[in-house]
Interface confidence: low
Amino acid sequence: GMEVRWCATSDPEQHKCGNMSEAFREAGIQPSLLCVRGTSADHCVQLIAAQEADAITLDGGAIYEAGKEHGLKPVVGEVYDQEVGTSYYAVAVVRRSSHVTIDTLKGVKSCHTGINRTVGWNVPVGYLVESGRLSVMGCDVLKAVSDYFGGSCVPGAGETSYSESLCRLCRGDSSGEGVCDKSPLERYYDYSGAFRCLAEGAGDVAFVKHSTVLENTDGKTLPSWGQALLSQDFELLCRDGSRADVTEWRQCHLARVPAHAVVVRADTDGGLIFRLLNEGQRLFSHEGSSFQMFSSEAYGQKDLLFKDSTSELVPIATQTYEAWLGHEYLHAMKGLLCDPNRLPPYLRWCVLSTPEIQKCGDMAVAFRRQRLKPEIQCVSAKSPQHCMERIQAEQVDAVTLSGEDIYTAGKTYGLVPAAGEHYAPEDSSNSYYVVAVVRRDSSHAFTLDELRGKRSCHAGFGSPAGWDVPVGALIQRGFIRPKDCDVLTAVSEFFNASCVPVNNPKNYPSSLCALCVGDEQGRNKCVGNSQERYYGYRGAFRCLVENAGDVAFVRHTTVFDNTNGHNSEPWAAELRSEDYELLCPNGARAEVSQFAACNLAQIPPHAVMVRPDTNIFTVYGLLDKAQDLFGDDHNKNGFKMFDSSNYHGQDLLFKDATVRAVPVGEKTTYRGWLGLDYVAALEGMSSQQC
């Protein structure tokens, strides 16, 4: 008949499993429960995948691995205290008197429950990596953490190569024994120990669970170290950089940690497993029953088969590991799980020209000299598109691309961003917002939805903010509907008249030049250079200012660059930014200072694109360590990452304007990196490429 084979990972667990099997059989619970002996949770997952066992209870990290690598699914979840349900929360606690935030953890002293423990290590370290705050090179998480914090107590890290830093705050027991042991000998071990490490001033932040502070303050602890502690003297660090009261853990935490869950193969009926266990818990979860499912005391251990704190088992509705783990925990695991043995020795960079090959070669040598991992290899291609093809075909690994190429790389070749460029805050030529500017005083105030028949001013044909984005956005929103892919005619028919300077005016609709004025002599009308006074972003704004047009499509800085005395030319000298407004996609108007919330799109920075199976954290980890050495254009280390002047070129490998490589954070897809508005505009334009 039908049977369910439970996988046990130790002798005590095998003993308890045998007793459970007997108790179920005695109670007539079907199907039969059998016990298979594995050597570890990992081994059990392999046995289940190989159809030699059927079920095991796993923690969050193991559920992630089992789901991702072996296709197993969670079907039954544990519930602990009623208030939180099938999860608890990993939090970062600080003293109220300190000024630490999640963004200023670098260099502070840290207290952890133990090495590789969920809330004390896996979640905080994974979260810091995944959010880009902590960069890891070559999968060496221990080194990264030891460099990041200004000393730690991580019980169990004594056997690692970084014990000096990771055990620096540990103190052992009262006689100094057991320093940094992953056991109660170390006074700073476990939840209460990590909190004690913070409370006694050894550390500045403690990574514990949501209930730890409240369980160890306000007179709730018997040990002398905690008796005088008040919960109000501590706060939680929130992911958005703020802090909150220790009771606010539902809103302010690093991750919701999912409860342990029973996992099975994808082809196993989860309902059957739940019915089996539900019958069992109905009979065997109360005190005094012959067998107790949620107690391990009789076997001299803790948490055998199920966690001892389980109050109930519940069926899991959406049986996918992603849904059970939740995005917060899932993201943390992505940041943490990096197998040095599976890390490729090389990162093959795509190069497009002789100067770029030279710079890439120098970069490879410079990185190798500094023992940066993985090593760089340079592979040439004919064009950005060719790079994308070669990356998809696994002949190359990475290339830096511009916005439009990122779109193609993501949409057509399935590539994802691994790191991005960051430019100086005042550098508005490399990343900027596209805005639609209008006069404030127009008695007939119109909105973005009412542009038909208006007069428009554009920087020039093909300019990102002057043409591609606004026209793409208007096509995408259905306002402009080109026939037979004739965008020019469609735009000329949509607006009453326009000025769209162009270099090659063959077959160019006359209305697109109707508002142009040429030079002071009236010559060179509509030409795609500064002889046309309405050319470029400044010119398009001038076209609006001089009442030639009703709307100008420009960069967010254009208004400020030409008002409030910033441009002394006669046409601009008296202009005030307050006299202009922006048209917002939601149909509203806004102050020109509100460009971040009211724009047609943001032109994104360039990004390093890779295959989706590439570990993006190792790519960023390499670039981050590299830029510490080579990122400054004045460094003396023999190579300049963000400068191309030695190679008689510009923007080689990276844009020269880059000041730092940055992590992608939550923008892990091409759409996320580019932003919905920019993607929509590109889709509007690409829909017309017949």
Epitope: R440, D441, S442, S443, A445, F560, N564, R576, S577, E578, D579, R589, E591, V592, S593, Q594, F595, A596
Partner: antibody, heavy 119, light 112 residues
């Protein structure tokens, strides 16, 4: 409760630079508009300029190129610099907040700091 | 700049009386969006100005309902239905429809 507090020297010599600080508590200067106004002897109030949540500045054209408003978001402070001062700039200087909640009327003011320009 | 003219310059009243202050703008304060950005402030002796009324007639939080504002276009009025001792000080009107914002010259409310 939103509070603004001006600070700076009470006496400035002619042709020198007047520098004032506005310290804000109870609200973040990364939201809203943060303004400087001055009141001359005899009750006349003059609007000087603002720095907005996104760091954009506006200056009253009457002050031309003499004025600069800057900020330090980490300290939640913003600053006024007025160059080449004359006796005409003797006034009480106020900082004030404007937000959308009151349609950009100045809903909270500092207590003011009196500045005399004299040699 | 847009000139705001307040009358009277000084307004002597007895406690409990009604007081009325007028403010006239040199041009209409109706913005192209239909709103009128006319505000009233009170500066008590030794204090900074405090917002009383925004956008013609909206009382700011904490302002007693004996204060009311009215008007349109270029002519506006602030009324205090029953003057109390704590209402004494200088009243200013201000417009922010046009840039830069400008203030009236002030009306001093004092005891007869």
């Amino acid at each position: 409760e939103v509070q603004l507090q001006e600070s700076g020297p009470s006496l400035v010599k002619p042709s020198q630079t007047l520098s004032l600080t506005c310290s804000v508590t109870g609200d973040s200067i990364t939201s809203g508009y943060w303004n400087w106004i001055r009141k001359f002897p005899g009750n006349k109030l003059e609007y000087m300029g603002y720095i907005s949540d996104s760091g954009i500045t506006y200056y009253n054209p009457s002050l031309k190129s003499r004025i600069s408003i800057t900020r330090d978001t980490s300290k939640n402070q913003y600053y006024l610099q007025l160059n080449f001062v004359t006796a005409e700039d003797t006034a009480t200087y106020y900082c004030a907040r404007r937000t959308l909640a009151t349609y950009y009327a100045m809903d909270y003011w500092g207590q003011g700091t009196s500045v005399t320009v004299s040699s | 700049d847009f000139v705001m003219t307040q009358t009277p310059l000084s307004l002597p009243v007895s406690l409990g009386d009604q007081a009325s202050i007028s403010c006239r703008a040199s041009q209409s304060l109706v913005h192209s969006n239909g709103n009128t950005y006319l505000h009233w402030y009170l500066q008590k002796p030794g204090q900074s100005p405090k917002l009383l009324i925004y956008r013609v007639s909206n009382r700011f939080s904490g302002v007693p309902d004996r204060f009311s504002g009215s008007g349109s276009g270029t002519d506006f009025t602030l009324k205090i239905s029953r003057v109390e001792a704590e209402d004494l000080g200088v009243y200013f009107c201000s417009q922010s429809t046009h840039v830069p914002p400008t203030f009236g010259g002030g009306t001093k409310l004092e005891i007869k």
